[in-house]
């Protein structure tokens, strides 16, 4: 139930987060499951634990295995498992499927490729980007924060994109790479002021306390490929990443679909283990392009509300 797959390449940094959460003040102990051997916390070790994080600096193939993290709460010890696989570097340019993160799609005038897992690392811009092992050069490619923007995308831009960055730990630098596929949807068309298909304006969405909930922000921007079109969620007028609630996350990247010939984007907001407090928040679905911005507001309500004191 509390298990997570992680993978990396030998001689690169790999950082893994414990699947169990807890207050920042809680101690987290890590163990190598096969031997029950404790992972040290001293940073002089190549593999060491740092609170919720397990760090391989750098990783070795022999590090592969299942790691147990135990969050020491005041009452119980809560256990999670990280299934780590470290692979040998490929001699050729082929990136095997098992090293690939989720595929993202782009279009002629709207493309963003996010660098997977980068938020776990202590890195500084710029990122380096490669396609099929070749460094990306030219004004069409712009490394912006944790993603790559490709201007005037062509079908030939489809392929496997690798981001490379440096993780810094106490003055020492370690390389990290991550690869994902990029597909291109090619279509000529026109651009419109954004039309939000879902949610409806001032929609009330019923959710069950303690369960997971998904909110989809879906908007169309015209026909064919779009330039600078985006959908995103805000909480109480704040970006999801700035709001600081780990249970509430946007789906990484934006899914593009073509509905009745229209170019549409959707962004799923995932709320894990819905809390009473979530009902107090204002959820804004924002759709924007060169024509302007449209906002639809959603609020959550408890399904079949009853007095929770029973």
């Amino acid at each position: 139930k509390f298990s997570k797959q992680s993978w990396g390449l030998e001689n690169e940094a790999l950082i893994v987060r414990c699947p169990r959460q807890g207050k920042p003040s809680y101690t987290v102990d890590w163990y190598y499951s096969q031997t029950n051997k404790s992972i040290p916390t001293q940073e002089r070790n190549r593999v060491f634990a740092s609170g919720q994080l397990l760090k391989f600096l750098p990783a070795a193939v022999a590090d592969s295995g299942i790691y147990t993290c135990i969050v020491r709460s005041p009452t119980f010890n809560r256990t999670g498992y990280a299934n780590v696989t470290i692979y040998k570097k490929q001699s050729d340019c082929n990136v095997p499927d098992y090293l690939m993160y989720s595929t993202v799609s782009g279009s002629e005038k709207n493309s963003k490729i996010y660098c997977p897992t980068i938020d776990l690392y202590n890195w500084t811009a710029p990122l380096e980007w490669f396609k099929n092992c070749q460094a990306l050069q030219g004004s069409r490619y712009r490394a912006h924060k944790s993603f790559l923007v490709i201007d005037n995308v062509m079908t030939e831009d489809a392929g496997d994109y690798t981001c490379k960055f440096i993780h810094n730990e106490n003055g020492a630098n370690y390389s990290v790479t991550a690869t994902r596929s990029f597909t291109v949807k090619d279509e000529q068309g026109f651009s419109l002021f954004p039309v939000i298909g879902a949610p409806a304006q001032n929609e009330i969405k019923e959710v069950e306390i303690g369960k997971n909930a998904n909110l989809t922000c879906s908007a169309c921007f015209g026909k064919g490929t779009q330039f600078l079109a985006a959908v995103l969620w805000q909480l109480n007028g704040t970006k999801i990443t700035d709001f600081g609630e780990p249970r509430i996350q946007q789906e990484e990247g934006q899914n593009q679909s073509f509905s009745n010939g229209l170019a549409c984007l959707d962004m799923v907001l995932r709320i894990a283990d819905v809390k009473e407090e979530d009902l107090l928040l204002q959820y804004d679905c924002l759709a924007l392009n060169l024509h302007g911005l449209r906002r639809h507001t959603v609020r959550l309500s408890r399904k079949n509300p009853i007095d929770h004191h029973s």
Epitope: K23, F76, G210
Partner: antibody, heavy 121, light 106 residues
């Protein structure tokens, strides 16, 4: 919707035992630890202990350790609190309670309606 | 165990007045939770993690503090705020509650 429904009031004689039940619904029973808190008439709240329904593991307040037993039945999503060697000062309302988000221990967001246990000869 | 001391034991104020309830802890804790209890009812969570307002709780309730001293404030008392208020720590086992502060509305 989360509900914690407790068994009815009990009258017991000193030296006897009492077993109070708390049936949970509206969420995945094994995902959340359940706690027991008691309140003597006109007094404050006192934490007795907690049970992890997934494993059956328990943590008791040392004050009750010799006399309290918490168990669970996953098939009925019910936890039980048994207190033995009852004395008059055990007369109290007994509550089961649950945190909102288990891993964050963010206070008791859900409470049962309470079970009054009266110990009298 | 961590001992929680609430003061005052009783607070008698008029509607619209500001109520300040204190909770002093025998050793430092990271967070504090606050509950309201009315006669014949189960406690109700008001504030969690020191300052976060629980769902459905009016904004006139607020919490603050750190270390060994924590405060619950009711900015403008309403008649329905008459109740006993408890602080609780979840820093170490056994979990403990304060003895309560009774708020009376004149």
């Amino acid at each position: 919707q989360v509900q914690l429904v407790q068994s009815g009031a009990e009258v017991k004689k000193p030296g006897a035992s009492v077993k109070v039940s708390c049936k949970a619904s509206g969420y995945t029973f094994t995902d959340y630890e359940l706690h027991w808190v008691r309140q003597a008439p006109g007094q404050g709240l006192e934490w007795m202990g907690t049970i992890d329904p997934e494993t059956g593991d328990t943590v008791y307040n040392q004050k009750f350790k010799a006399r309290v037993t918490m168990t669970r039945d996953t098939s009925t999503s019910t936890v039980y609190m048994e207190l033995s060697s009852l004395r008059s000062e055990d007369t109290a309302v007994y509550y089961c309670a649950r945190a909102f988000y288990n891993d964050y221990d963010d206070g008791f967001a859900y409470w049962g309606q309470g079970t009054l246990v009266t110990v009298s000869s | 165990e961590i001992v929680m001391t609430q003061s005052p034991a009783t607070l008698s104020l008029s509607p619209g007045e500001r109520a300040t309830l204190s909770c002093s802890v025998s050793s430092s804790v990271s967070y504090m939770h606050w509950y309201q209890q009315k006669p014949g009812q189960a406690p109700r969570r008001l504030i969690y993690d020191t300052s976060k307002l629980a769902s459905g709780i009016p904004a006139r309730f607020s919490g603050s503090g750190s270390g060994t001293d924590y405060t619950l404030t009711i900015s403008s008392l309403e008649p329905e705020d008459a109740a006993v208020y408890y602080c609780q720590q979840w820093n170490s086992s056994p979990l403990t509650f304060g003895g309560g502060t009774k708020v009376e509305i004149k």
